[in-house]
């Protein structure tokens, strides 16, 4: 296993809808032709897998069916999408790249992205 | 870029089928290939996918336990293998290169009868 | 899964017609791509990541759309597009596909 860089957002706030948008960009040592991008939430020192990816020539990430992230590739960058925050899923939010084929295999995990995640406040009851 | 897949194929119910994909004219490495069923008169289904390189797979799960898809790097093939074959299984089998779909063999008739 | 339901199902045009095909998603998805098919041969892919068109399509083919809702319009029909053209999606697996538009002539 060799280690690879990563490097992603230091911050991100989410929209009012709940989604956040960042980038995940790699320093691939060769010509990777098959990627494998997993996105980890760390939050009270615990880690858990938010969603993944295995992805090939194409420019579409393609996730499992209740997955909450979209994303798309270009390049050494993958720009992920996550929806369906609350304020209860602010944490760090960190990118791990696999270059899975050909050999050898790399590994590379970034800092984290801080998500910020307001729920936006209920509208107040309209006399009109 | 060019892809060929074996010939026709008549089964019982409840036998098994392997149906290859021999690609060629580009890196077989490089990119998923899709397997993706067309019964007769009917849309097109995708049953899964396999990276050759690694052998990584996803499966459409109303295929799961019944279908296992393979690939062979060292003559550039792919296999997908159903089992517990029904009559609804009598479709026309395609295998197809990439994210992109982007070519297809003409495709394998599997024809599930008794 | 996502469901891709195509419209009109079924389509009778005259050449030289403009014709539009919809899409519409159950979920919002990234992209969407659009196959032709005609009888008795493979699909053929037309368009990917929702307007690039497919080496050798010709421009009187075009895709649009977002989210939940896409088109795949021919400006002028020719007596080879009649066909079979489905939708696909590729955001979440299982990759699907809507149940296709036939296209025929008038």
């Known amino acids: 296993c060799k280690a690879m860089h990563v490097a992603q957002p230091a911050v991100v706030l989410a929209s009012s809808r709940g989604i956040a948008s960042f980038v995940c960009e790699y320093a691939s040592p060769g010509k990777a032709t098959e990627v494998r991008v997993t996105v980890l939430r760390q939050a009270d020192s615990q880690v858990t897998e938010v969603c993944a990816a295995t992805y090939m020539m194409g420019n579409e990430l393609t996730f499992l069916d209740d997955s909450i992230c979209t994303g798309t590739s270009s390049g050494n960058q993958v720009n992920l999408t996550i929806q369906g925050l609350r304020a209860m899923d602010t944490g760090l939010y960190i990118c791990k790249v696999e270059l899975m084929y050909p050999p050898p295999y790399y590994l590379g995990i970034g800092n984290g992205t801080q998500i910020y995640v307001i729920d936006p406040e209920p509208c107040p009851d309209s006399d009109f | 870029v060019q892809l060929v897949q074996s010939g026709a194929e008549v089964v019982k119910p409840g036998a098994s089928v392997k149906v290859s994909c021999k690609a060629s004219g580009y890196t077989f490495t490089s990119y998923w290939i899709n397997w993706i069923r067309q019964a007769p008169g009917q849309g097109l289904e995708w049953?899964?996918?396999?990276?050759?390189?690694?052998?990584?797979?996803y499966y459409n799960e109303m295929f799961t336990g019944r279908v296992t898809l393979t690939r062979d790097t060292s003559t550039s093939t792919a296999y997908m293998e159903l089992s517990s074959l029904r009559s609804e299984d009598t479709a026309v089998y395609y295998c197809a290169r990439g994210d992109y779909f982007d070519y297809w063999d003409q495709g394998t008739m599997v024809t599930v009868s008794s | 899964d996502i469901q891709l339901t195509q419209s009109p199902s079924f389509l009778s045009a005259s050449v030289g017609d403009r014709v539009t095909i919809t899409c519409s998603a159950s979920?919002?998805?990234?992209?969407i791509h659009w196959f032709q098919q005609k009888p008795g041969k493979a699909p053929k892919l037309l368009i990917y990541?929702?307007?690039t068109l497919a080496s050798g399509v010709p421009s009187r083919f075009s895709g649009s759309g977002s989210g939940t809702e896409y088109t795949l319009t021919i400006s002028s029909l020719q007596p080879e597009d009649f066909a079979t053209y489905y939708c696909?999606?590729?955001?979440?697996?299982?990759?699907?596909f809507g149940q296709g538009t036939k296209l025929e002539i008038k």
């Open positions: 979920k919002s998805v990234s992209y």
């Open positions: 990541d929702t307007s």
């Open positions: 696909q999606q590729r955001t979440t697996y299982p990759l699907t």
């Open positions: 049953i899964g996918r396999i990276a050759p390189g690694s052998g990584t797979t």
